[in-house]
């Protein structure tokens, strides 16, 4: 039960995280004009990974895409790459994790396969989250560097008579969305990896026998746990010490009331 919950929660958290990474990647407000020196600017600038925008006081917003590829800073290209890799890995991870979910049955998929898929998706989510966090952090570092560089050269002009105020940019909303989303994807991935441990069939040194005393029918179940000898065809991770409380995989057609070991 706890394994199913951990896996399910990991999936949901990762799903929210990846949705956030996609949102952050698409958002225009990666960097916004710093208003410290001009808090009431009539023209507000902000930039994303794909285009830059200008919002005028009338409310009109004009956005222009970065139609060049070679002319863009290498760091921006790197951030784009990290975010896209994060999205792709996350999407694949989601696809894999759907099939790995304990509450979803696909044919006669064994728990060991589900465990492997859960681990794979978990690792994918962790890498996806790290890519997003790295991408956002690289961009943030780039902003900080440019901010202080433009502060040092804030006012230029002939003899100080004419001031050319350089537009300084600070952290935009997308950075915070990206950090949070990356963190959620990472947490979701860790949860999936933890759930994998609970799903994995454990090696035991005894053959488990389960008796179902229900008046008329008695069931002899060899291989309750997959024994070290490989005995028994039932490779499902059965808990035979449940005292009657069955997991979803243990629902049987026997009309028994109690399980005894």
């Amino acid at each position: 039960m706890a394994v199913t919950a951990c896996q399910g929660l990991g999936f949901v958290v990762s799903l929210i995280g990846i949705a956030g990474i996609i949102a952050a990647t698409c958002m225009d407000q990666w960097s916004t004009q710093d208003l410290y020196n001009n808090p009431v600017t009539a023209v507000f600038n902000y930039q994303g990974l794909w285009r830059s925008c200008v919002r005028e006081s009338s409310g009109f917003t004009e956005c222009r895409g970065y139609f060049t590829l070679l002319g863009l800073p290498a760091m921006l290209q790197a951030v784009r790459a990290l975010m896209i890799v994060g999205i792709v890995l996350g999407a694949i991870g989601l696809l894999v994790s759907i099939f790995a979910l304990k509450c979803i049955r696909i044919g006669s998929m064994e728990d060991s396969a589900k465990a492997n898929m859960t681990l794979t998706s978990g690792i994918m989510f962790i890498v996806s989250g790290l890519c997003a966090i790295a991408g956002v952090s690289v961009f943030a570092n780039m902003l900080v560097t440019n901010f202080w560089m433009s502060t040092a050269n804030m006012y230029t002009g002939m003899g100080g008579m004419v001031q050319t105020v350089q537009t300084r940019y600070t952290f935009g909303a997308a950075l915070f969305v990206g950090w949070v989303a990356g963190g959620l994807t990472l947490i979701g991935g860790v949860m999936m990896c933890i759930a994998c441990r609970g799903l994995a069939p454990e090696e035991t040194n005894y053959k488990a026998v389960s008796y179902h005393a229900s008046g008329h029918s008695v069931a002899y179940k060899p291989g309750g746990f997959k024994a070290s000898t490989g005995f028994g065809s039932n490779t499902k991770n059965k808990k035979i010490y449940d005292g009657g409380a069955r997991t979803e995989d243990e629902v049987q057609s026997y009309p028994s009331k109690h399980d005894y070991v």
Epitope: V40, A42, Q47
Partner: antibody, heavy 120, light 113 residues
């Protein structure tokens, strides 16, 4: 066609207040901000502030804060400028203008002006 | 506040002549985000409200005769009237549209000889 109709001339006593109107017609009122300017006789123009009917956002020139108040009556597409504690320095022509939206980012249509004379 | 300085304060020309008036701003009106200059030119005839001639430093407002041309970038701007007509008798103002408070130049009064 776009029109900004301003209220008539005002003769007021020092210390009093005056409220003038600017009625917009011929366009979608909530789309465009309304700007207010002051022009002393034979002098240049001074920006007082603006009001955006879309989100009721109001901005003032620091110089006119406490002196000017902008309000709106959306039902009649009218923006009001109220000037308080009037002195002889407030004697001027006050204009309202529509700020263009989009490519035409400037004050593209102006009212005829409201003349305010402060005299005892 | 951005200070707008216009020169000359007045000039007198004959009809048909070319006129150039200057406007300088204390800060750049060029916005880095869209490489657009936020400067407008207005014409105010006696007893009338100002009329928009040029916005974005060089874009002519619809209905404005093509003899009016705006140019310049950053802090230095120019309004040129290629062939002055009698009806061009007016005061011409430049205006900062980039930062609050919006500020106007002192104006250039154009007189016809």
């Amino acid at each position: 066609q776009v029109q900004l109709q301003q209220s008539g001339a005002e003769l007021v006593k020092p210390g009093a207040s005056v409220k003038m109107s600017c009625k917009a017609s011929g366009y979608t009122f909530t789309t465009y901000p309304i700007e207010w300017m002051k022009q002393n006789h034979g002098k240049s123009l001074e920006w007082i502030g603006n009001f955006h009917p879309y989100n009721d956002d109001t901005k003032y020139n620091e110089k006119f804060k406490g002196k000017a108040t902008l309000t709106v009556e959306k039902s009649s597409s009218t923006v009001y400028l109220e000037l308080s504690r009037l002195t002889s320095d407030d004697s001027a022509v006050y204009y309202c203008a529509r700020r263009g939206y989009g490519s035409s980012y400037a004050m593209d249509y102006w009212g005829q002006g409201t003349s305010v004379t402060v005299s005892s | 506040d951005i200070v707008m300085t216009q020169s000359p304060s007045s000039l007198s020309v004959s009809a048909g002549e070319k006129v150039t008036m200057s406007c300088k701003s204390s800060q750049s009106l060029l916005n880095s985000g869209n490489q657009k200059n936020y400067l407008a030119w207005y014409q105010q005839k006696p007893g009338q409200p100002p009329k928009l001639l040029i916005y974005g430093a060089s874009t002519r407002e619809s209905g404005v005769p093509d003899r009016f041309t705006g140019s310049g970038s950053g802090t230095d701007f120019t309004l040129t009237i290629s062939s002055v007509q009698a009806e061009d008798l007016a005061v011409y103002y430049c205006q900062n549209d980039h930062s609050y408070p919006y500020t106007f130049g002192g104006g250039t009064k154009l007189e016809i000889k």
